[in-house]
């Protein structure tokens, strides 16, 4: 049995121009310490979308579900999509650490976006 | 019925050690974060030891750091904690705790009486 | 580390009435919309019971005169209305991301 899985229920999410997208992640436990991060793409050349402690980040806000009991829930909506944001972006959680350590990401969740 | 026994408590003099166990049922341990959290008089509630679901993660407060070992058996159900270099200020009932999430304390044994003295 | 101070030290409520205790973190324990604040019981010589976990969840099985409130650094337990069995020392507990965890100091609720 997995210490901790990172799950991200949704394949793909498809969203009209100018609407908001929610992407669902869930950690099942808070051990190992450390934040979760959302990537857009994978690689060196990935772009980070949220990190709750550092950056700025105007169109993305967490809207997590704190009632639920059995796992965390980190989820993102990010406002205002335009056809730029396509893509698939993936739940990563760290390790705290100097400097964090990845451990594992969600299996990531394809946006896609629709004319308005 | 969720129960966590624990067991191992006494009296040492300074310096000594004690290892201290949890044996746990009515829940499935191997997917539960598991910890130590004392309690004195004097302190309140101290947060000892946490251990993640499958015992790759251990974390201490700089009060015990190097001197207490947590670690778990999920086979048999149980948690250990080692303490080492005891000192009189951990003196205290120690309690062993379930945690479903990692985050809050939801189930706590009956606390054993760890007693430090010369 | 983060400081819990918890208020009042002890607190004596009638039957009936309204019992409310505070807990002021040193630095915020709230992360992607969740507060890592929780809140126990315990009642003489027995372990810590869970009443409200992130702040302001009930636990499965606690009466709902139990209610938590709060984000950030500032939580709130209230207990409305007050009855003879909840006659027992509360405390809280942060359990954030900055190590170590840690608790408030208690407060001892009495009947007046």
């Known amino acids: 049995e997995e210490e901790l899985q990172v799950i991200q229920p949704e394949k793909s999410v498809s969203v009209a121009a100018g609407e908001s997208a929610t992407l669902n992640c869930t950690a099942t436990s808070l051990i190992p310490v450390g934040p979760i991060q959302w990537f857009r793409g994978v690689g060196p050349g990935r772009e980070l979308i949220y990190h709750q402690k550092e950056g700025h980040f105007p169109r993305v806000t967490p809207v997590s579900d704190p009632t639920k009991r059995n796992n965390m829930d980190f989820s993102i909506r990010i406002s205002n999509i335009t056809p730029a944001d396509a893509g698939t972006y993936y739940c990563v959680k760290f390790r705290k650490g100097s400097p964090d350590v990845e451990l594992k990401s969600g299996a990531g969740t394809e946006l896609s976006v629709r004319a308005k | 019925e969720v129960q966590l026994v624990e067991s191992g408590g006494g009296l040492v003099k300074p310096g000594g050690s004690l290892r201290l166990s949890c044996a746990a049922s009515g829940f499935t341990f191997s997917s539960y974060v598991m910890s130590w959290v004392r309690q004195t008089p004097g302190k309140g509630l101290e947060w000892v030891a946490t251990?993640?679901?499958?015992?790759?993660?251990?974390y201490y407060p700089d009060s015990v750091k190097g001197r207490f070992t947590l670690s778990r058996d999920n086979a048999k159900n149980s948690l250990y904690l080692q303490m080492n270099s005891l000192r009189a200020e951990d003196t205290a009932v120690y309690y062993c705790?379930?945690?479903?999430?990692?985050?809050?304390?939801?189930?706590w044994g009956q606390g054993t009486t760890v007693t430090v003295s010369s | 580390d983060i400081v819990i101070t918890q208020s009042p030290a002890s607190l004596a409520v009638s039957l009936g009435e309204r019992a409310t205790i505070s807990c002021r973190a040193s630095?915020?324990?709230?992360?992607?919309?969740?507060?890592?604040m929780h809140w126990y019981q315990q009642k003489p010589g027995q372990p810590p019971k869970l009443l409200i976990y992130?702040?302001?969840n009930l636990e499965s099985g606690v009466p709902d005169r139990f209610s938590g409130s709060g984000s950030r650094t500032d939580f709130t337990l209230t207990i409305n209305p007050l009855q003879a069995e909840d006659v027992a020392t509360y405390y809280c507990h942060q359990s954030s991301e900055n190590l170590p965890w840690t608790f408030g100091g208690g407060t001892k609720v009495e009947i007046k």
């Open positions: 992130r702040a302001s």
């Open positions: 630095e915020s324990v709230d992360s992607y919309g969740m507060s890592f």
């Open positions: 251990i993640s679901s499958g015992g790759t993660y251990t």
């Open positions: 705790a379930s945690s479903v999430d990692g985050s809050a304390f939801d189930y």
